[in-house]
């Protein structure tokens, strides 16, 4: 008789990240008997939904069901049928939907209603769709990376899990960049958090954490670009915008109505004598950087120190994991290596932005032109945000680690969100903790 393997005693969870530019579905798996151990939950699948973010479906809500089908069917295949009914599904929408809600709460509700109706049709345990706050987005991102890096585990290890690690239990700060917002979250060093809105208190695995977090709405890379264009077109003498953030020879026509569609450009809105304008790239990093800095109001600070726009920011402390678009953009530009100094990154960006558009298109033939055209802006924006926005220096740049995955799981808010909603992060330390091998990509 053949030996039959005992069924794996595992559990699954699904989180959909409904971002401003796209939606991704993540499937997580963990041993059922080790739910409260740190580092045992891992990602087994990521499915990127084809199409834009859910906020773009506001005039075509009837298409949302089809939009979600492929990835939900993929989840049906990956998760054993016997476990479908007990697998929780959560959808969290971020800044794209926060912006839509600011424009029209009714339209945002309608989108979420249709999303909920669609997701309720699957055999999983659907737990609802909601717009998460910027504070949650920052906090869950911080929990995710520290959980995956084993920072919450009290077990001392005989080996070092990451090459740059100094103090095993020092948590990493989290830097998250999306299309519509950006989050900064970390534990300040013996510093009071002067604004209550930015303070979070956690007790995780028997230890207390006083965490600083802020989410800058409209300062994700896509909305920052819209802001910059709206600001710059104000002073353009005609319908040609010579833009240093695009490669020389690049041309693109922009509708003024599209420019003013987002609440993020309201402060720059004016009546223009034209309905369209043409961006003409001139590819100059320094000028691009200067233009971006004008989006950060640093003239006003009601606290001992600020990031920008009057938002409190304590002195930076410890190492930081920079993920989501921070990672994707820097990875494309080949600037994620630990060995690359801030000066070197700036040098590379200068060269990259100055490259003619025709040359860039040839070198990166496989990349969609819409994305390809924006890497000069995005890379420059990342440098401006980290250096002038968050006050990293040439020295502290070395503390930023551009992270895509840790132990095979994507860095981002979704894992932390699921861990919280499934009560898998105990306040107190469990009796035994497993050794967890952490690596990052």
């Amino acid at each position: 008789t053949q030996n039959k393997a005992l069924p794996e005693n595992v559990k699954y969870g699904i989180v959909l990240d409904a971002g401003s530019s796209h939606t991704s579905l993540y499937i997580y798996k963990w041993p059922a008997e080790k739910e409260n151990d740190t580092g045992v939950v891992h990602q087994v699948e990521e499915c990127r939904v084809k199409g834009p973010g859910i906020s773009k479906f506001v005039q075509k809500v009837n298409e949302i069901g089809i939009y979600l089908t492929d990835c939900m069917e993929r989840a049906r295949e990956v998760i054993p049928r016997s476990q479908h009914q007990e697998t929780p599904v959560y959808l969290g929408a971020t800044a794209g939907m926060r912006l839509l809600r600011m424009e029209s709460e009714e339209l945002a509700d309608r989108v979420l209603d249709v999303v909920e109706r669609s997701l309720s049709n699957y055999p999983f345990d659907f737990q609802g769709a909601r717009i998460i706050t910027g504070q949650e987005e920052g906090a869950y991102g911080w929990i995710t990376i520290n959980y995956l890096l084993g920072k919450f585990s009290q077990k001392t290890r005989w080996f070092s899990i990451v090459p740059y690690e100094t103090n095993n239990q020092e948590t990493f700060g989290a830097l998250d960049l999306g299309g519509a917002s950006t989050q900064v979250t970390f534990v300040p060093q013996n510093q009071t958090i002067e604004s209550p809105d930015n303070a979070l208190q956690f007790r995780l695995y028997g230890k207390d954490y006083n965490v600083y977090t802020h989410s800058f709405l409209c300062y994700g890379k896509d909305q920052a670009l819209w802001q910059k264009l709206a600001k710059d077109i104000q002073v353009a003498s005609n319908e040609i915008l010579r833009d240093p953030c695009f490669h020389p020879g690049y041309k693109k026509v922009v509708n003024v109505s599209d420019l003013y569609k987002t609440p993020c450009t309201k402060r720059f809105e004016m009546t223009l004598p034209f309905q369209q304008f043409e961006i003409q790239g001139i590819g100059n990093y320094q000028q691009c950087h200067q233009s971006i800095l004008e989006l950060f109001n640093t003239s006003y600070c009601p606290y001992s120190q600020c990031a920008f726009n009057g938002i409190f920011l304590p002195p930076l402390a410890g190492s930081f994991g920079a993920f989501s678009a921070f990672y994707f953009v820097m990875k494309f530009l080949n600037l994620t290596s630990e060995k690359v100094s801030q000066e070197k990154v700036t040098e590379m960006m200068k060269k990259f932005c100055a490259q003619p558009w025709e040359e860039i298109k040839t070198s990166y033939a496989g990349v969609k032109e819409k994305y390809l055209s924006e890497y000069c802006f995005s890379g420059t924006y990342i440098l401006s945000l980290l250096l002038q926005g968050y006050h990293f220096t040439a020295d502290s740049w070395a503390q930023i680690h551009f992270i895509g995955k840790i132990q095979g799981s994507d860095a981002g808010w979704t894992l932390g969100y699921m861990l919280n909603l499934t009560n898998m992060i105990p306040a107190e330390q469990p009796l035994s903790t497993p050794l967890s091998h952490s690596t990052y990509v």
């Epitope: 809600r101 709460e105 945002a108 509700d109 979420l112 209603d113 909920e116 109706r117 309720s120 737990q127 609802g128 769709a129 909601r130 717009i131 706050t133």
Partner: antibody
């Protein structure tokens, strides 16, 4: 489509309690708060409180604290409003009304048909 | 708590006329927290305007809301026979309160 169906009219004696139900359909029950508003004959609208069906948390108007209890049953998508120590001035039509999603603003988008509660000896 | 005072108590107008209803708050109300409802006899109230000036789905464009701070207005540009009803304003600041209502009746 969204529907809120309330239980039928009640006649109660002073000092008694009444429990009115409101069954929701056509949307994800846990996603929207539910409010209770009453209207005495020929009078205006008076807000009593709200419940978050997702977690069961409640917020009551000061006037009704200690006398009103709002609960929910997620398995049947139903919310309940119980008012105790009834007096004649509690004679009114009681409405449930669907409120906001989390993070939204407090306006009452959809109303039940109303339940008349008469308090009389 | 914030008290909302509606005026006039009754408005007697003919179909086709313009109706202007006022709602005054005892202290400043954020515009996003002011709404208007219509109630006909024997029916539940119906949301008309939210966020002081946004029309709820399906509400005709003859209904418009305006105002900020402590003074808000509901305007019905041309009264239709079905518009004769009681109108309530509502605010939210920790707790919900309603105004006493304005009855729009046929002259």
């Amino acid at each position: 489509q969204v529907q809120l169906v309330q239980s039928g009219a009640e006649v109660k004696k002073p000092g008694a309690s009444v429990k009115v139900s409101c069954k929701a359909s056509g949307y994800t029950f846990k996603s929207y708060e539910m409010h209770w508003v009453r209207q005495a004959p020929g009078q205006g609208l008076e807000w009593m409180g709200r419940i978050n069906p997702s977690v069961g948390s409640t917020w009551y108007a000061q006037k009704f604290q200690g006398r009103v209890t709002m609960t929910r049953d997620t398995s049947t998508s139903t919310v309940y409003m119980e008012l105790s120590s009834l007096r004649s001035e509690d004679t009114a039509v009681y409405y449930c009304a669907r409120g906001k999603r989390e993070g939204g603003t407090e306006y009452l988008r959809k109303w039940g048909q109303g339940t008349l509660v008469t308090v009389s000896s | 708590e914030i008290v909302l005072t509606q005026s006039p108590g009754t408005l007697s107008l003919s179909p086709g006329e313009r109706a202007t209803l006022s709602c005054r708050a005892s202290q400043s109300v954020a515009s996003s927290y002011l709404a208007w409802y219509q109630q006909k006899p024997g029916q539940a109230p119906r949301l008309l305007i939210y966020g002081a000036s946004n029309r709820h789905t399906g509400i005709p464009d003859r209904f418009s809301g305006s105002g900020s701070g402590t003074d808000f207005t509901l305007t019905i540009s041309r009264l239709e026979p079905e518009d004769f009803a009681v109108y309530y304003c509502q605010q939210y600041h920790n707790a919900i309160t309603f105004g006493g209502g304005t009855k729009v009746e046929i002259k």
